[in-house]
Amino acid sequence: AESCTSRPHITVVEGEPFYLKHCSCSLAHEIETTTKSWYKSSGSQEHVELNPRSSSRIALHDCVLEFWPVELNDTGSYFFQMKNYTQKWKLNVIRRNKHSCFTERQVTSKIVEVKKFFQITCENSYYQTLVNSTSLYKNCKKLLLENNKNPTIKKNAEFEDQGYYSCVHFLHHNGKLFNITKTFNITIVEDRSNIVPVLLGPKLNHVAVELGKNVRLNCSALLNEEDVIYWMFGEENGSDPNIHEEKEMRIMTPEGKWHASKVLRIENIGESNLNVLYNCTVASTGGTDTKSFILVRKADMADIPGHVFTR
């Protein structure tokens, strides 16, 4: 059986067939004798009971309120009532875009990673017996597909697959032709799978400093959005009031990864800051990477090979 209409807020396009199906339908069949009522309220009108005489466009079945078709003035709140069961929906009917095969406000956006499998299936179970034909359009151009009953696209995504895909069902009811349209805006993006995070630059850095001066140690990494970058130093982090971790900066790369940088600022350098390890670590679910900085007094520079210095 078709799903009931569980969403409390619904937006539909004028001119299309539409239905509301309450969610105690199986229950309703068991108690055929129970009084079942549909109501509408909008603006000044409070709880007007609906019946086929209310409008030639409205049809009532066991569990369903049908609109043939739905129009702008159908906007409002709808209620189904049976014994102590009530279900409510808020219906918003929007204007159709007459210059396109779809209405922009009724588009469902989806993102697919390149090379990943995606599938669009055009099907409408509720109106199945009334549907004459169903077509699938890409950017309002009809796609020639084998299955005319339920057109389906199933493939590994390529960048040229990006676009607006519209399933259009054509159906007859009481001698009139209607169509129902559902459009997906498919965006194809680069592979978003996680990378192994890496710290940029040498693993061990000797930094020449002068006592009493300040130094900024910059730690940069290429990482995933959920990865973390942090500094470790001394016996207990934060015990030295002259050491400050600056706010982390992040920039997104074109591939959807992140370039992060975190600075450790050491002010009024003292003897206690020399020849100790200041470690910067990037951590992810895939593991960690660490690089170390050692502050060296400028006078002692001659003891260290030149290539290990950073500015």
């Epitope: 989806k110 995606f118 669009i120 299936t121 559902k182």
Partner: nanobody
């Protein structure tokens, strides 16, 4: 991060049964329907069954009606596919996928599992 993980596949004799599981995480289960698909070597992927988490409504491909049963445990965010009276032609990789459009209307399956292999020997 949205994840679908299938399990329960394996090698089974014709006439036997299997119960496949699809464990979902990273999204609100009640807002989605879960479809089961299969892909046999050299063939297209086909949808065999689907269940809407919101109201439990189901659907089956004609080729599996009566032998396949789909069910869900919303508390565990898991969908099951019970396969009975297995035939050699059921041999395939079985995938689960999620859709926010339900099982009965135009739908787009956006998240896919890695698949679980089912092999039926005669």
């Amino acid at each position: 991060e949205v994840q679908l993980v299938e399990s329960g596949g394996g090698l089974v004799q014709a006439g036997g049964s299997l119960r496949l599981s699809c464990a979902a995480s990273g999204f609100t289960f009640d807002d989605y329907a879960i479809g089961w698909f299969r892909q046999a070597p050299g063939k297209e992927r086909e949808e065999v069954s689907c269940i809407s988490s919101s109201d439990g409504s189901t659907r089956y491909a004609d080729s599996v009606k009566g032998r396949f049963t789909i069910s869900s445990d919303n508390a565990k965010n898991t969908v099951y596919l019970q396969i009975d009276s297995l035939k050699p032609e059921d041999t395939a990789v079985y995938y689960c996928a999620s859709t926010s459009e339900g099982c009965h209307d135009d739908r787009f399956y956006d998240y896919w599992g890695q698949g679980t292999q089912v092999t039926v020997s005669s």
